[in-house]
């Protein structure tokens, strides 16, 4: 049985994204929060055990400041990988001749505040390739869209974005 | 605290490389996050960046004065330098080192400088 | 190149309020710091990130920024405050506007 508004003939308009504010976080609850990205685990370091966690991320359709000129920032885990890529392909099909950037990733220098995912790979703060700022409230829509578990408008510079740790997301999926 | 202290000759002459050196002291040049500048100052004119480097040694020039300048990092010294070819009357100002921060994506602050050294062209 | 532009001096009578201006093209976008600089004298930061203060820097500074103009806001002013400032913006090259004398009458 079709059910209402799954008729044949109904066409399917593409749905209106609104760019988010400056300072809109999605979803509305705090980044460590069951709600968003969850609790942190602990920082990851070059000789920690869990460093084999992160995965770097050769996506030629995505910028990589590097400023650091050690490739960390291309280093994050599964799930942010998998995110970051389907923002990339969103951001390309957005504005043509445009690119995704990552000015940071994982973060071995301490630059960010305590118990950050920057720490564990499992977040990244992105701008587009022209760095044109009128874009970034559309660009932080899209990364919601593209399914980050927590979407920040942080900065005008750039929009962090984080995920769940892999062992929640398998725990839930029953994997 | 950090300090900065810039060295170097007080007079250079037309069409010669003027040489400076920034020493960091109280803290170390290899901190991430910031970015070893320099500006300097015309007589009674307004303030004008040069350029500046990250640690890791990624350099930004001011795109007016690129082709003449050269800025590098010597983290053994905890020092910094700044080198510009072909000066004229016209580099003639008062030279400052400054520790610059980031805000966002090269949106830089200068929150420390050192005395600042003139510098004058002249044959 | 991007340009800042600043009026080249400000009056004010102590213990009124100093509004000094800073303009530019979607400046908005962009955060903005200010200096000032006493004859002689080094520039000190003032503010940064378009309204933050480091510290030791009175209370009586404050800033903003929307649109195509940043503000310095110097409220009770005092004499000691005479100086020339200046709004910096950056963008991969930092731009330092043209300058502002304030003057304390």
């Known amino acids: 049985i079709i059910g209402p508004g799954r008729g044949f003939g109904k066409r399917r308009h593409p749905k209106k994204l609104t760019p988010l504010a400056y300072k809109q976080f999605i979803p509305n609850v705090a980044e460590k929060t069951l709600g968003a990205s969850g609790r942190y685990e602990g920082k990851i370091t070059r000789n920690s055990e869990r460093f084999k966690e992160l995965t770097p991320n050769y996506n030629p359709d995505i910028i990589f400041k590097d400023e650091e000129n050690t490739g960390a920032d291309r280093l994050m885990t599964q799930r942010c990988k998998d995110k970051l890529n389907a923002l990339a392909i969103s951001v390309m099909n957005q504005w043509p001749g445009v690119k995704l950037r990552v000015t940071e990733g994982w973060d071995e220098d301490g630059h960010h505040s305590e118990e950050s995912l920057h720490y564990e790979g499992r977040a990244v703060d992105i701008t587009t390739s022209d760095r044109d700022r009128s874009k970034y409230g559309m660009l932080a829509r899209l990364a919601v869209e593209a399914g980050f578990d927590w979407v920040y408008y942080e900065s005008k510079a750039h929009i962090h974005c984080s995920v769940k740790a892999e062992n929640s997301v398998a725990a839930k999926s029953g994997g | 605290q950090v300090q900065l202290q810039e060295s170097g000759p007080g007079l250079v002459k037309p069409s010669q490389t003027l040489s400076l050196t920034c020493t960091v002291s109280g803290g170390s040049i290899n901190s991430g996050g910031f970015y070893w500048s320099w500006i300097r100052q015309h007589p009674g004119k307004g303030l004008e960046w040069i350029g500046s480097?990250?640690?890791?040694?990624?350099?930004y020039y001011n795109p007016s004065l690129k082709s003449r300048v050269t800025i590098s990092v010597d983290t053994s010294k905890n020092q910094f330098s700044l080198k510009l070819s072909s000066v004229t009357a016209a580099d003639t100002a008062v030279y400052y080192c400054?520790?610059?921060?980031?805000?966002?994506?090269?949106?830089?602050?200068?929150?420390?400088w050192g005395r600042g050294t003139l510098v004058t062209v002249s044959s | 190149s991007y340009e800042l532009t600043q009026p080249p001096s400000v009056s004010v009578s102590p213990g009124q309020t100093a509004s000094i201006t800073c303009s530019g093209e979607k400046l908005g976008y962009k955060y903005v710091s200010w200096y000032q600089q006493k004859p002689g004298q080094s520039p000190v930061l003032v503010i940064y990130h378009d309204n933050k203060r480091p510290s030791g820097i009175p209370e009586r500074f404050s800033g903003s920024n929307s649109g195509n103009t940043a503000t310095l806001t110097i409220s009770g002013t005092q004499a000691m405050d005479e100086a020339d400032y200046y709004c910096q913006a950056g963008d991969s090259s930092a731009v330092f506007g043209g300058g502002t004398k304030l003057t304390v009458l």
């Open positions: 480097i990250y640690y890791s040694g990624n350099t």
């Open positions: 400054a520790r610059g921060q980031d805000s966002g994506d090269y949106d830089w602050y200068f929150d420390l």
